[in-house]
């Protein structure tokens, strides 16, 4: 099966790499604009220069293109705890990330929030915190893992998953209560 090409891809594929078909004259191949620039005017004829202009402040193009406008620079989302790793330049978008001892949780493909790495109190670090993944903790005896925190088995309700992990402790508590009755 031949993959379906969009109109722009069809037009580009007729020209050699680094060139695109003139939108008004399909016998002309114009040179694409370099990254950091955008298309101001198509080339007037074969072998003639495309009129490319540099992106203005607050915008960029990261690859060769024939875009009529540069792309707007991304802004790091303060409300999501994001910080700027590197600022936007004419040929590269802003890079956002998280502070030290934080990880990124992606709510969707292009939206992440920064959260503090778990410290594994009342447990040990099984896997260290990574850029896109929280610490994985293993809990000490008498504690169970709830939302990546080690919680005392005294907080384990019988209906919860923790009953398997806390079973000896639950029985001890029950045994203690029973022995207290006369």
């Amino acid at each position: 099966l031949v993959p379906h090409l969009g109109d722009r891809e069809k037009r580009d594929s007729v020209c050699p790499q680094g060139k695109y078909i003139h939108p008004q004259n399909n016998s002309i191949c114009c040179t694409k604009c370099h990254k950091g620039t955008y298309l101001y005017n198509d080339c007037p004829g074969p072998g003639q220069d495309t009129d490319c202009r540099e992106c203005e402040s607050g915008s960029f193009t990261a690859s060769e293109n024939h875009l009529r406008h540069c792309l707007s620079c991304s802004k790091c989302r303060k409300e999501m705890g994001q910080v700027e790793i590197s600022s936007c330049t004419v040929d590269r978008d802003t890079v956002c990330g998280c502070r030290k001892n934080q990880y990124r949780h992606y709510w969707s493909e292009n939206l992440f929030q920064c959260f503090n790495c778990s410290l594994c109190l009342n447990g040990t670090v099984h896997l260290s915190c990574q850029e896109k993944q929280n610490t994985v903790c293993t809990c000490h005896a008498g504690f169970f893992l709830r939302e990546n925190e080690c919680v005392s088995c005294s907080n384990c309700k019988k209906s919860l998953e923790c009953t398997k992990l806390c079973l000896p402790q639950i029985e001890n508590v029950k045994g203690t209560e029973d022995s207290g009755t006369t």
Epitope: R77, K78, E79, W107, Q113
Partner: nanobody
Framework: EVQLLESGGGLVQPGGSLRLSCAAS????????MVWVRQAPGKGLEWVSH????????YYADSVKGRFTISRDNSKNTLYLQMNSLRAEDTAVYYC????????????WGQGTLVTVSS
């Protein structure tokens, strides 16, 4: 006790509009960034939009950009979602929630309001 109560859902034809509201109580609403998420039948939660504390900074999922508008009225402790040019794929239960703080889970969210887009 924290309460979030969504309203405004219903049956609407493709291309139609709805305005969802979320009445908040039990916490300082003006201090919390707020979120709209949705769950389509048989699918997972999808982040739709969020808004910062003062209503200046907003975010929209690509699927709703240009059609939905999030806003808030801190004097009324209410969050809104104006939904225009509705499509069948917008059919879902819509929930409001406060932006998670300690980890990737919603500490407080409402019971949801069902939006059905169908002709």
């Amino acid at each position: 006790e924290v309460q979030l109560l969504e309203s405004g859902g219903g049956l609407v034809q493709p291309g139609g509009s709805l305005r969802l509201s979320c009445a908040a109580s039990g916490f300082t609403f003006a201090h919390e960034p707020m979120v709209w998420v949705r769950q389509a039948p048989g699918k997972g939660l999808e982040w739709v939009s969020h808004i910062d504390r003062v209503g200046q900074d907003t975010y929209y999922a690509d699927s709703v950009k240009g059609r939905f508008t999030i806003s808030r009225d801190n004097s009324k402790n209410t969050l809104y979602l104006q939904m225009n040019s509705l499509r069948a794929e917008d059919t879902a239960v819509y929930y409001c929630a406060s932006l998670p703080k300690r980890g990737p889970r919603f500490d407080y969210w409402g019971q949801g309001t069902l939006v059905t887009v169908s002709s």
